[in-house]
């Protein structure tokens, strides 16, 4: 690689070589001075070219010298402008300047970009006393240039509260391209054209871009960085990326993958959590969502009987938590579940079915037909009634609970009784005379106690008087008269 | 607009040589390489290769090296295509076209029909 | 090199008709290009990356494939599309066309 020094806009050349200004480190240096630490740099400059003051800050002094001549205007010595070199590379420059012996104290300061170069930087300034003047040399060197050190660098001197300050010298750190801006993994929708972008800059510039697609180059001529690729749609997964070249060589962005959206895989792992008389309570496992987020699930749930009609109930729910309650089953059922989940793209197959079953429940109506008698001549009441319908039992009938309040001069007495569950009539002893009798049955099962039936009140009359008329609620939607044998 | 204008028709004997012309305007030439495209009389469309217009780099399909030639002058916008020794198997229509991304030959010239006869 | 086979070689229909053109590659390609050709004339393109009309091209033409199976759909044929119609492939070089279909007109 060539390392190059130009002064610039300078009437006369710095140093003889290949062109007005310039340094290859191919060739040896006019005068190169060794480091303490025996590292050679790549460049060096030295102080001690021919030189003029530059039109800078200068220093005027106002001493006269014993023969009362007027001292020269202080002035860094002129030196390189403009330093190009590769990255790694070592570099050293320099500022240097006569001051005369009557200044004391006189220390140079090196900034970059405006800023004081302070502490870890080799800076190194050393003085050549002379009878009248002392030159004064700093050098500031890197050893592995990096672009971090591209700037402006001069040098400051502090004398009589003047400030001199130097031409500037500029660094510029060339390499390989850099990456500013490369292609993103993305997920497409199939043939659909979307957008890749890929910036490099150097130095040197100017950099130029060439677009990678499976490994077959898009572009067969360069594009200027920064390069916007149009994909015009794709139909199955592809690694993009770019190539960034520039006269030091070249650069390859990471490969990205593009991948194309499509239909989710089914859930997997669907599971019973928990079951109740009327609710069950799933969860499941989401399959590959195909590059494309889940919107929501249906969960559909059918009959297991082989008897029933086969109809599918569907509850739809969002893709999270992955757990759904199903409500309004029947208990003591079999049921077939299974999940199917959405994405933009559409719905997945449905997961594989499972089998789960409700439990036993209260039932969810009262008995029928509740009729009331009182049987004088035992001084009992009667109770009659039919079973709630079979499907509404909601699970093995164990009993019934009969309520019977006793109502009398404002005193009020319930009492309740269990019966087993074959017969559908029960009798209980008249507890009050002169009083109202109410009854209310609930059917029973092992999943707990149902509603009561509507009250059916019958009057229990003092001693004597006898009633023979039956009270008794008629069945739901029956208009028929009851018959009592 | 964008065109690609070819030079004419021409009559060569064979071993002779021909020199065909592909002058572009209507976009920066140094940005899209120049293909080459031949069809020989009844036949189909035969790649020749291309010219990469930015570095001045040839690249020539199997069948067309040799006797074949690519070059450009970018100042004044055009590809040349050069064929010497001319066999009668030469006689053909010729085509430049614009390569763009993908290979696509998005503009074409008019052809420019060599035919080679003794 | 990619060899590019398209059939029919010739498709004989009628205006109005459905035409379906095949181009299958010898392995797989990333994208496909379309070119009409009509009789002395230079060919145009017509289906730019499988599946994207070139410019001025009406909608009756459709591309369509992946891998190595490509086709070139005209929903309706007009009296102007009977012409020959080359596939060209873009995966890897040479950059190769296909033998080409002529449709006629029945």
């Known amino acids: 690689a060539i390392t190059e020094a130009r002064e610039e806009a300078k009437p006369y050349p710095l140093f003889p070589g290949p062109f007005p200004g310039s340094l290859q480190t191919d060739h040896t240096p006019l005068l190169s001075l060794p480091h303490a630490s025996g590292y050679q740099p790549a460049l060096m400059f030295s102080p001690t070219q021919p030189g003029r003051p530059h039109t800078g800050n200068v220093a005027i002094p106002q001493v006269t010298s014993v023969e009362s001549k007027p001292l020269p205007p202080l002035a860094f010595k002129h030196t390189v402008g403009h330093i190009i070199l590769s990255e790694h590379k070592g570099v050293k420059f320099n500022c240097s300047i006569s001051v005369p012996n009557i200044y004391q104290d006189t220390t140079i300061s090196w900034w970059k970009d405006g800023k004081e170069l302070l502490g870890a930087h080799h800076a190194i300034t050393q003085f050549y006393p002379d009878d009248e003047v002392t030159a004064i040399i700093a050098s500031f060197s890197i050893t592995s240039v990096q672009r971090s050190d591209n700037g402006s660098y001069i040098c400051k001197m502090k004398i009589n509260n003047e400030e001199i300050v130097s031409d500037p010298i500029y660094i510029e750190v060339q390499g390989l391209p850099h990456f500013t801006k490369q292609p993103e993994s993305m997920n497409v929708t199939r043939n659909t054209a979307f957008n890749l972008t890929c910036q490099a800059v150097g130095p040197p510039e100017p950099v130029n871009i060439f677009w990678v697609q499976n490994s077959s180059r898009v572009n067969e001529q360069p594009e200027k960085s920064p390069s916007v690729l149009t994909v015009p749609g794709l139909t199955e997964m592809a690694v993009f990326s770019c190539e960034a070249h520039n006269d030091k060589g070249l650069t390859v962005s990471k490969g990205v993958q593009i991948n194309i959206k499509a239909i989710p895989s089914p859930p997997t792992e669907v599971s019973i959590r928990n079951s109740t008389a009327h609710s069950i309570l799933i969860s499941w496992v989401p399959g590959f969502d195909g590059y494309s987020p889940f919107r929501n699930c249906s969960i559909q749930v059918k009959e297991a009987d082989p008897l029933s009609n086969g109809s599918v109930m569907i509850f739809n729910t969002s893709a999270l938590p992955h757990l759904y309650q199903i409500k309004q089953l029947q208990a003591l059922a079999n049921y077939s579940i299974g999940v199917s989940c959405m994405n933009e793209i559409g719905w997945s197959a449905v997961s594989p079915w499972i089998l789960a079953s409700t439990t036993e429940g209260a039932p969810s109506v009262a008995p029928l037909n509740v009729t009331v008698f009182l049987n004088e001549s035992s001084d009992n009441v009667d109770i009659r009634w039919m079973k709630p319908p079979t499907k509404q039992q909601d699970g093995e009938l164990v009993g019934y609970r009969i309520s019977h309040v006793w109502q009398s001069a404002g005193i009020s007495k319930e009492l309740l009784e269990e019966v087993g569950q074959n017969g559908s009539r029960a009798r209980i002893s008249v507890q009050v005379h002169n009083a109202t009798c109410t009854v209310r049955i609930a059917a029973v099962t092992r999943g707990g106690v149902g509603p009561f039936s509507d009250p059916v009140k019958i009057f229990i009359p003092a001693h004597g008087w006898v009633d023979y008329a039956p009270s008794s609620t008629p069945a739901p939607g029956n208009a028929d008269p009851v018959l009592i044998i | 607009q964008v065109q690609l204008v070819q030079s004419g028709s021409e009559l060569k004997k064979p071993g002779a040589s021909v020199k065909v012309s592909c002058k572009a305007s209507?976009?920066?030439?140094?940005?899209?390489?120049v293909h080459w495209v031949r069809q020989a009389p009844g036949q189909g469309l035969e790649w020749m290769g291309w010219i990469n217009t930015y570095t001045g780099e040839p690249t020539y399909a199997q069948g067309f090296t040799g006797r074949f030639v690519f070059s450009l002058d970018t100042s004044v916008s055009t590809a040349y295509l050069q064929i010497s020794s001319l066999k009668a198997e030469d006689t053909a229509v010729y085509y430049c076209?614009?390569?763009?991304?993908?290979?696509?030959?998005?503009?074409w010239g008019q052809g420019t029909l060599v035919t080679v006869s003794s | 090199e990619i060899v590019l086979t398209q059939s029919p070689a010739t498709l004989s229909l009628s205006p109005g008709e459905r035409a379906t053109l095949s181009c299958r590659a010898s392995?797989?390609?990333?994208?496909m290009h379309w070119y009409q050709q009509k009789p002395g004339q230079a060919p145009r393109p017509l289906i730019y990356a499988t599946s994207n009309l070139a410019s001025g091209i009406p909608a009756r033409f459709s591309g369509s494939g992946s891998g190595t199976s490509y086709t070139l759909t005209i929903s309706s044929l007009e009296p102007e599309d009977f012409a020959v119609y080359y596939c060209?492939?873009?995966?890897?070089?040479?950059?190769?066309f296909g033998g080409g279909t002529k449709v006629e007109i029945k």
């Open positions: 076209t614009r390569g763009t991304r993908y290979a696509y030959m998005d503009y």
């Open positions: 209507g976009y920066t030439f140094t940005n899209y390489g």
């Open positions: 392995s797989s390609v990333g994208y």
């Open positions: 060209q492939q873009w995966s890897s070089n040479p950059r190769t």
